[in-house]
Interface confidence: low
């Protein structure tokens, strides 16, 4: 006798129900079946500047009761607890962050750190995360955050100051690129051609920069891994999340076509704070010297 597909399904269903109490899938007597997890990325690094405040985050995933979390600094094989240091919790919908505050960063803060959680008499340790501290004195040539923020407009400020040859060259390049681009434009769908997610562009530039700076730069992803480096030119704060904005003139394509679509930009809308609101297309020209 052949086993009917429907019967097979019922049989499987029976076994699932039979095994549920043993698999601990259901929430029995209010007990949640999940472990505490610490989402510090393996070999994560932060390049930071002495004298700047910094927040080192330990992403913590837990169910009912928040575990007791501590930070320690690796010293050889031992990890020295950092007890007097200012710490705080940042709660978000699906994950919490136990933050170690460096207010500000000191040269001796260089080194590897680890967070650990005590949960139901279990000790869970994270991967270590390394801080590379650049001393203020050796970084005295570093441009100010205000200078960094104003750099995108540097080109336009220079134009009146004898920038006519540059303007002509730019226009010529733009014309050539537009001609070349027209051929490709037909291949793209209407929306794909018009709307580039600025956050994606930002991430791409971070990935490029990461390959040159060996620095993990990941926005909060679905897996809950979150590494922010506050020293990529300047910090931007949106709510309680810190996003790093790499130097705006680096690692960008020559011409980026985009129409402003604030629903696409999402929480990082400050990325476009220097861009005037317009429903029309625009081309952002990146000129390298």
């Amino acid at each position: 006798m052949k086993t009917l597909p429907a019967m097979l399904g019922t049989g499987k269903l029976f076994w699932v129900f039979f095994l549920i109490p043993y698999l601990d899938i259901w929430n029995i007597h209010g007990k949640e079946s999940c472990d505490v997890q610490l989402y510090i990325k393996r070999q994560s690094e932060h390049s930071i500047l002495a004298g700047d405040p910094f927040e080192l985050e330990c992403p913590v995933k837990y169910c009912a009761n928040r575990p007791h979390v501590t930070w320690c600094k690796l010293n050889g094989t031992t990890c020295v607890k950092l007890e007097d240091r200012q710490t705080s919790w940042k709660e978000e919908k699906n994950i919490s962050f136990f933050i170690l505050h460096f207010e500000p960063v000191l040269p001796n803060d260089n080194g590897s750190y680890r967070c650990s959680a005590n949960f139901q008499s279990n000790l869970i340790e994270s991967h270590s995360t390394t801080l590379y501290v650049t001393d203020v004195k050796s970084a005295s040539e570093r441009p100010s955050k205000d200078e960094m923020a104003s750099r995108p407009w540097l080109l336009y400020r220079l134009l009146p100051l004898g920038g006519l040859p540059l303007l002509i060259t730019t226009c010529f390049c733009l014309f050539c690129c537009l001609r070349r681009h027209q051929g490709k434009q037909n291949e793209l769908s209407d929306t794909a051609g018009r709307e580039i997610n600025l956050v994606d562009a930002h991430l791409k530039s971070e990935q490029t920069e990461a390959s040159t700076r060996q620095n993990s730069q990941v926005l909060l992803s679905e897996t809950g891994i979150y590494d922010n480096d506050p020293d990529l030119c300047f910090r931007m704060q949106e709510g309680s999340e810190v996003y790093s904005n790499p130097c705006l003139e680096e690692n960008k394509p020559g011409i980026v076509y985009a129409s402003l679509n604030h629903s696409v930009i999402g929480p990082n809308s400050r990325l476009a704070r220097n861009v005037k609101e317009a429903p029309t297309e625009y081309a952002s020209i990146c000129v390298r010297s």
């Epitope: 405040p53 950092l82 007097d84 240091r85 505050h101 910090r235």
Partner: antibody, heavy 118, light 112 residues
Framework: EVQLVESGGGLVKPGGSLRLSCAAS????????MSWVRQAPGKGLEWVAS???????YYPDSVKGRFTISRDNAKNSLYLQMSSLRAEDTAVYYC????????????WGQGTTVTVSS | DIVMTQSPLSLPVTPGEPASISCKSS????????????LAWYQQKPGQSPQLLIY???TRDSGVPDRFSGSGSGTDFTLKISRVEAEDVGVYYC????????FGGGTKVEIK
């Protein structure tokens, strides 16, 4: 109650050495950042040295290489070893709890006077 | 190093009248991530050690009378005494703890 009591001040010749002590009570010294702040006669306040609970020590350029901050956790005491003393080091030296970066000195001792003179 | 500049150097006051002390830093003491200004105010009465009045630029320390208030952000800060009392005589210092520790030169408050 938190109490900080400094001792070890006195008269010393230029180029000489002196060790200041600060006996802490009412808290576990090893769990807190500690600092020394000085005040020259008729002048303002000047930060001299800091030690954090992790043992990291910090100094301004004016005393770097000459002064050493340390602590004895068993004795719950803080120390400031001063060498190559100069006339400009003459001051009242205060022991403070807090006062490392990111934290203002919130408990102060009564101070001990150091006079550097020939 | 961050330089702290206080003014005036001396402030003669009448009891019951308000008083204001200004403090300027050579660079911003505001950390954008936590929106805190790393500035404190101290009072030093004659023959005594300094006492913390205000931290985070505007938070009064416990036990400090509410006639004392701190304000300002970035590089410009102010300590205000709403109604000066005779016991408020002394030297007032501002101090930054953003990067290293530096104090202002002090403002001597005295009764007219």
């Amino acid at each position: 109650e938190v109490q900080l009591v400094e001792s070890g001040g006195g008269l010393v010749k230029p180029g000489g050495s002196l060790r200041l002590s600060c006996a802490a009570s009412g808290f576990t010294l090893s769990s807190y950042g500690m600092s020394w702040v000085r005040q020259a006669p008729g002048k303002g306040l000047e930060w001299v040295a800091s030690i954090r609970s992790d043992g990291n020590t910090y100094y301004p350029d004016s005393v770097k290489g000459r002064f050493t901050i340390s602590r004895d956790n068993a004795k719950n005491s803080l120390y400031l070893q001063m060498s190559s003393l100069r006339a400009e080091d003459t001051a009242v030296y205060y022991c403070t709890r807090g006062g490392y970066y990111g934290s203002s000195p919130y408990y102060w001792g009564q101070g001990t006077t150091v006079t550097v003179s020939s | 190093d961050i330089v702290m500049t206080q003014s005036p150097l001396s402030l003669p006051v009448t009891p019951g009248e308000p008083a204001s002390i200004s403090c300027k830093s050579s660079q911003s003491l505001l950390y954008s991530s936590n929106q805190k200004n790393y500035l404190a105010w101290y009072q030093q009465k004659p023959g005594q050690s300094p006492q913390l009045l205000i931290y985070w630029a505007s938070t009064r320390d416990s036990g400090v009378p509410d006639r004392f208030s701190g304000s300002g952000s970035g590089t410009d800060f102010t300590l205000k005494i709403s109604r000066v009392e005779a016991e408020d005589v002394g030297v007032y210092y501002c101090q930054q703890y953003y990067n290293y520790l530096t104090f202002g030169g002090g403002t001597k408050v005295e009764i007219k």
